[in-house]
């Protein structure tokens, strides 16, 4: 999906109202200096693109975000102000057959989400150079 | 599996108001996502508003200030209050749910037509 033509301003107020406090409250107890960045994104799609990656596709150590309350916020986010994300979410989920799998926080998830957190940041500031 | 039904559509003048009900039952989850979606003819299906189980809420610029959503979790019903409505807003209304066991919406209603017209 290109995240192009997102209202990216009405994505940063959602975020800023509510993912934000969702994904401080799943890193509760972790340290903000515990785990690098090493993701980054150069401009708010890209970002989007990063964002979406590492929150609904399961990787290894961490297979379930995307059943967090922060994940579903981002997705009905991106349907609402992404034009045809939601048709493209809808056909995916046709096309594929469901898989379920148990909420478990690793470690690994919690690195996942340290990085969602600085995706966010930078997501949030877009005029700041790419360090 | 969870089952829901819509109910409260139907036709309605211009500045008009509507309430649409989404009643789910089966095996339902605390932590979820409700949605109401629309589909005009010829146009792609739209998430207009969602409510989360902490009691957050979005909404299209479309209908934000005349549309309100809102949840019953003890009737484990959503509804969408639909106010000042416009022509523009006429199209078949879905509810949709996902909840902390489930995909993208995997679940559905059979929708509910809505016409705004004089």
């Known amino acids: 999906y290109d995240f192009t033509n997102c209202d990216f301003e009405k994505i940063k107020a959602a975020y800023l109202s509510t993912i934000s406090k969702d994904l401080i409250t799943y890193m509760s107890g972790t340290k903000s200096t515990e785990f690098n960045n090493t993701v980054s994104c150069s401009n708010r799609p890209h970002c989007l693109t990063e964002i979406q990656s590492l929150t609904f596709n399961p990787t290894a150590g961490c297979a379930s975000l995307a059943k967090e309350m922060f994940a579903m916020k981002t997705k009905a986010a991106l349907a609402i102000w992404c034009p045809g994300y939601s048709e493209t979410q809808i056909n995916a989920t046709q096309a594929m057959k469901k898989r379920r799998k148990r909420k478990v926080t690793t470690n690994k998830c919690l690195e996942q989400v340290s990085q969602l957190q600085g995706l966010w940041r930078r997501f949030n500031r877009p005029l700041l150079k790419q360090q | 599996e969870v089952q829901l039904v819509e109910s409260g559509g139907g036709l309605v003048q211009p500045g008009g108001s509507l309430r649409l009900s989404c009643a789910a039952s089966?095996?339902?989850?605390?932590?979820?996502?409700m949605g109401w979606f629309r589909q005009a003819p010829g146009k792609e299906r739209e998430l207009v508003s969602a409510?989360?189980?902490?009691?957050?809420?979005l909404y299209a610029d479309s209908v934000k200030g005349r549309f309100t959503i809102s949840a019953d979790n003890s009737k484990n019903t959503a509804y969408l209050q639909m106010n000042s409505l416009k022509p523009e807003d006429t199209a078949v209304y879905y509810c949709?749910?996902?909840?902390?066991?489930?995909?993208?919406?995997?679940?559905w209603g059979q929708g509910t037509l809505v016409t705004v017209s004089s």
């Open positions: 949709a749910r996902e909840d902390s066991s489930s995909g993208w919406f995997d679940y």
């Open positions: 409510i989360f189980s902490d009691g957050s809420t």
């Open positions: 089966g095996r339902t989850f605390r932590s979820y996502v």
